[in-house]
Interface confidence: medium
């Protein structure tokens, strides 16, 4: 399928001009290669009319140009002084020949309808309203005013000043005058449909002295706005329907042959295909709202329509806005797993992609909630503190420069199952959605900490050990101290690393962390985890309480921990005042200040796929073949 996209059908009238925009994928080659516009003949040949190399055909001389906009990945063909001879089939495309990548465009030029010379033309979109201005002479001020619609042989009354109204205009037509001006009356017709199109006559007075004015009302289906988006990226439909429908229910639907199937509305309806990846956000009191869809799929391409009606469903005669969405399969957004599986008590590490050109952007992780219009409260961010209910079990690790940041969630429960979004305050296309599935654990966890009831005594030495299976032998083990700004990695000692790499004794694989001397600030959550380079794997968490020594007793660490960790000389002492490297939290988490919600996401986040490296079906992380370096972490 060609990745070039443009308008399928372009229509205009004789003498007017058109502007045709064609989109191409964001690559250096595409930005610099030849762009062309050609006309398709009966033989299948496509004859160039204009190209970015400077070619201009005789028939377009003086009335057409082609402009490339590499920063937008678009080029535009402008054609003026259209005639019905311009009606035909065309291609816009890229390449050195006209057989390159292209998109078919049908251009249709209609004749201008013949109208009486003094006709005033009003052009309106379906569902909108029109106010027709009808001037008259002062002597006709006391006379009857009326508006009628011309049919072939007669003029059918729409409304008059004696309050007569045609049944098909009841509740839609109003005849009025403004202030003290006695030389003009107005007729307003609302909820316009195609049926309202045609010729009208305003009249004041009767007989030869009557004032008459011809009016031509054109009611058009709005031209669809073109949206060119990458596979797995996100799209925002910005819908502006006007103040008159501000209080009506809003909807977004997708055209399906004769009908428009509602995808989401403000009354709570949502298509299951969009579960976890859609939000509808009322913008203001002027009838504006937006719909955000992340994780675009091939099948999302198509014709969309937004509108407003009390039913939350499409209704004739109500304003609409339309889009044609093209999903480019040559996506720059990496293909990641969209479902991550974890087990109760276990952990998941979710790799969130972001635009590598924006490594300094603020990173966020939010949980999609489908109630109401859908919203996504931020749970953690590079400058957003972890939400209280996730204390000790959620952290974001930013790895500047490599296009990925990692979110780790441990102590999983079935309540954690659901949809989550990775997003930044930068390139909104890189908004990704992952579904977290949590199954009941059927076996012991891979990582176990001893002692399990960890209480350290002030001023003494305290050691905790993390046991790991042989399959993690070659991976890097770490301990980190959790705070609501992240998890700060601490020096630790890997017992297993000293063994021969040929055999692996399951009982002696452990990584220890020592606090010496214990201070009150050491109280809190600690994580033990494994990672391979910048790829984070499983974690487990433990809360260490700190208490004062009770009189007449000395505190002893549980023997099972010390039995495996009698390497005091080799263990590194952790100074409890280690400075934390993370960004300090700020009260306002960037663009999502309101209740930390990604509600008005408009166009500032994107897409959905995740690679939960620690989250395969059985809770294991990816194995690694890299050599383990024998040193203290």
């Amino acid at each position: 399928k060609s990745p070039i996209f443009g308008p399928q059908e372009v229509s205009s009238i004789e003498g007017d001009s058109v502007s045709i925009t064609c989109y191409y994928p964001d690559t250096s080659v595409n930005r610099h290669t030849r762009k062309y516009w050609c006309r398709q003949g009966a033989s299948g040949m496509c004859t160039t009319l204009i190209s970015s190399n400077g070619y201009l055909s005789k028939e377009y001389s003086g009335r057409a140009n082609l402009i490339n906009f590499p920063e937008n990945n678009t080029f535009v063909i402008n054609i003026e002084q259209l005639t019905q001879d311009d009606t035909g089939s065309y291609k816009c495309g890229l390449g050195t020949s006209n057989r390159g990548l292209s998109f078919d465009v049908s251009l249709e030029v209609s004749q201008v309808p013949e109208l009486p010379s003094d006709t005033h033309v009003y052009t309106k979109d379906i569902g909108r309203n029109v106010t027709i201005e009808c001037p008259f002479k002062r002597e006709n001020a006391p006379s009857k005013k009326s508006l009628c619609k011309k049919t072939n042989q007669s003029c059918e009354l729409v409304i008059d000043s004696t309050e007569k109204v045609n049944p098909s205009y009841i509740g839609r037509a109003k005849l009025f005058m403004k202030g003290t001006d006695l030389t003009v009356f107005y007729v307003n017709i609302s909820h316009l449909t195609h049926n309202d199109a045609g010729l009208y006559i305003c009249q004041a007075g009767e007989g030869p002295s009557a004032d008459k004015k011809n009016v031509d009302l054109q009611v058009l289906a709005p031209e669809p706005e073109l949206l060119y988006k990458d596979l797995r990226s996100s799209v925002t439909f910005e819908c502006d329907l006007g103040r008159e429908v501000a209080n009506e229910a809003k909807y977004l639907c997708r055209m399906n042959k004769e009908t428009c199937d509602v995808i989401i509305n403000t009354l709570g309806k949502r298509d299951p295909d969009f579960e976890g990846r859609i939000l509808i956000t009322p913008k203001d009191d002027n009838g504006r709202f937006s719909v955000l869809i992340t994780g675009l799929r091939k099948e999302d391409a198509g014709h969309y329509q937004c509108g407003a009606h009390s039913s939350g469903l499409p209704q004739e005669g109500w304003p609409i806005q339309t889009w044609q969405l093209f999903v480019n399969e040559e996506s720059t957004i990496p293909n990641r797993r969209s479902v991550v599986k974890g087990v109760t008590g276990g952990s998941v590490a979710i790799a969130c992609p972001y635009n590598p050109k924006e490594s300094s952007s603020l990173k966020y992780w939010c949980r999609w909630e489908g109630d109401g219009n859908g919203h996504c409260p931020v749970l953690v961010g590079t400058q957003a503190q972890v939400q209280e209910e996730y204390e000790g079990r959620l952290a974001l690790f930013d790895q500047p420069g490599n296009g990925t940041y990692t979110v780790i969630l441990n102590q999983l429960t079935t309540e954690d199952a659901g949809f989550y979004w990775c997003l930044t305050n930068g390139d909104s296309r890189w908004r990704t959605t992952i579904e977290l599935q949590v199954a009941e654990a059927t076996r012991e966890p891979n990582l176990e900490v001893t002692p399990q009831n960890a209480t350290a005594v002030l001023g003494e030495t305290f050691t905790v050990s993390c046991h790991y299976p042989c399959k993690f032998y070659s991976q890097e083990k770490y301990w980190c101290k959790w705070s609501n700004k992240g998890c700060h990695i601490l020096p630790s000692h890997d017992e297993g690393a000293r063994q021969s790499s040929v055999s692996c004794d399951q009982s002696s694989q452990l990584v220890s962390m020592t606090l010496n001397p214990v201070s009150k600030e050491d109280e809190g959550w600690y994580w033990c985890g494994v990672k391979q380079g910048q790829t984070y794997g499983e974690t487990t968490a433990i809360y260490i309480a700190v208490e004062e020594r009770t009189r007449g007793s000395s505190h002893v660490n549980p023997t099972d921990a010390n039995a495996r960790a009698k390497v005091a000389l080799e263990e590194e002492v952790v100074d409890s005042s280690i400075s934390e490297k993370e960004n300090k939290a700020i009260p306002n988490p960037g663009p999502f200040a309101n209740e930390r919600e990604i509600q008005n996401v408009g166009d500032q986040a994107q897409e959905n796929r995740a690679s939960g490296d620690a989250g395969s079906a059985d809770g294991q992380s990816r194995s690694s073949s890299s050599k383990h370096h024998h040193h203290h972490h």
Epitope: Q8, E9, S11, I13, Q84, T87, S89, D104, S106, E108, V109, S110, Q111, V112, P113, E114, L115, K149, K150, T151, N152, T193, H194, N195, A197, G198, L199, D216, Q218, V219, L220, A221, E258, E316
Partner: nanobody, 125 residues
Framework: EVQLVESGGGLVQAGDSLRLSCAAS??????????MAWFRQAPGKEREFVAS????????DYADSVKGRFTVTRDNAKNTVTLRMNSLKPDDTAVYYC????????????????WGQGTQVTVSS
Amino acid sequence: EVQLVESGGGLVQAGDSLRLSCAASGRTLSFDTYAMAWFRQAPGKEREFVASIDYNGGSTDYADSVKGRFTVTRDNAKNTVTLRMNSLKPDDTAVYYCASARYYRSGTSFPVNYWGQGTQVTVSS
């Protein structure tokens, strides 16, 4: 380009019925973006509007002379538009043309951009 082909014309008696069909083909990217209409031209007269139908069939319009006797319908799945003519009169004798437009407009102001070749309807008394 769009090709419009009419069919169904013929010779009938006054009071009879006839059904004209118009099939759209060629590069019709989506038939439902065209408003459709029927016009007719009697010998020695100008072409006149008969009936029109909007994109999805929601709105129709008729010349006063055929109101109540003629019905226009469309089937977007089949790219066809039909004119059902009942109680035919000798005055209905003409060549009937199918037409399409990008804008739906009622009556004579229907802005045609494609015409069919026409089909002859003759009503004898």
